[in-house]
């Protein structure tokens, strides 16, 4: 199959592909809000092979407006064509298509994380899935941003091997009795726009000196 993909905005739906917890999630929105499908079927083909469309089994007759394609789309070197069909009963209300190059079009959602504040350091625990497919690593770097009193510091921890399992990073040399906020995100080598996590903040407990000063009062 060959293809031609200028930037048209008059398609009946818009698609977005995201790496969410290292799962490839395709989501869609209808531009015409007067169309109200009861269910959708998602199909795809690979541009490099003139094959017939394949129905995504777990996204056939689905009522959701997203689909997990992790087990279908394995290659970051392939271009994929998605076809979405929307139904009301047995009637096809619409069908629309989009071309995807995972390495270009994928947006990377931030991983889940927790923080625990100590007197002069913060433990940042980042949660990755226990197993992550090699092809879904995307040459990603984990970035941890530390913010305090208007100053932002970037930490790029070196992760040995795959981003899998839980990972703990210590932000040290911090000032006691100070409020710190932390955000994490995944950075791609191609300098795509990053999606930063919401900030998580903690007020570090006071150090020993201020503790003894407090008790002396």
């Amino acid at each position: 199959i060959s293809y031609d993909s200028p930037d048209y905005t008059d398609e009946s739906c818009t698609f977005k592909i995201s790496l969410r917890n290292f799962r490839s999630i395709l989501s869609w929105e209808l531009k015409n809000h007067s169309i109200v499908p009861t269910h959708y079927t998602l199909l795809y083909t690979i541009m490099s092979k003139p094959e017939d469309l394949k129905v995504v089994k777990n996204c056939a007759n689905t009522t959701r407006s997203f689909c997990d394609l992790t087990d279908e789309w394995r290659s970051t070197h392939e271009a994929y064509v998605t076809v979405l069909e929307g139904f009301s009963g047995n009637t096809t209300l619409f069908s629309c298509s989009h071309n995807f190059w995972l390495a270009i079009d994928m947006s990377f959602e931030p991983p889940e994380f927790e923080i625990v504040g100590f007197t002069n350091h913060i433990n940042v625990m980042v949660k990755f899935p226990s197993i992550v497919e090699e092809e879904l690593q995307f040459d990603l770097s984990l970035v941890i941003e530390e913010q305090s009193e208007g100053i932002v510091k970037k930490h790029k921890p070196e992760i040995k091997g795959n981003m899998s399992g839980n990972f703990t990073y210590i932000i040290d040399k911090l000032i006691p009795n100070t409020n710190y906020c932390v955000s994490v995100y995944l950075e791609h080598s191609d300098e795509q726009a990053v999606i930063k996590s919401p900030l998580k903040c903690t007020l570090l407990p006071p150090g020993q000196e201020s503790e003894s000063a407090e008790s002396a009062k």
């Epitope: 031609d4 048209y8 009946s12 169309i35 017939d52 069908s95 629309c96």
Partner: nanobody, 122 residues
Framework: QVQLQESGGGLVQPGGSLTLSCAAS????????MSWVRQAPGKGLEWVSA????????YYADSVKGRFTISRDNAKSTLYLQLNSLKTEDTAMYYC???????????????QAQGTQVTVSS
């Protein structure tokens, strides 16, 4: 009821050109991918080309790539297929279909599908 009326076929010499048209009615044309399939004498239906609802994306089978061009006019609810550099193996009945046709292709043909005959012969 979905109605698709193909036209523009004919007899043409190898290397020649034709433009097929498909007038659509009975559904909201602009909301649908459209495609062309063909059936050569004594053969099964074969997928040829598809175009996205807005016309921004076009797709072609390897056998016609670089020779055929699919397009659409949503204001006129009409689908087109420009056939250039025709070969004898392009001889077939050509049908347009609503949505992206896939096996069994016959499921995608309009109820009273007529098609338009293209014959490439010297």
């Amino acid at each position: 009821q979905v109605q698709l009326q193909e036209s523009g076929g004919g007899l043409v010499q190898p290397g020649g050109s034709l433009t097929l048209s498909c007038a659509a009615s009975g559904f909201t044309f602009r909301n649908h991918i459209m495609s062309w399939v063909r059936q050569a004498p004594g053969k099964g239906l074969e997928w040829v080309s598809a175009i996205s609802s807005g016309g921004g994306n076009t797709y072609y089978a390897d056998s016609v790539k670089g020779r055929f061009t699919i397009s659409r006019d949503n204001a006129k609810s009409t689908l087109y297929l420009q056939l250039n550099s025709l070969k004898t193996e392009d001889t077939a009945m050509y049908y347009c279909t609503k949505d992206w046709a896939r096996p069994p292709y016959s499921d995608f043909l309009a109820p009273q599908a007529q098609g338009t005959q293209v014959t490439v012969s010297s």
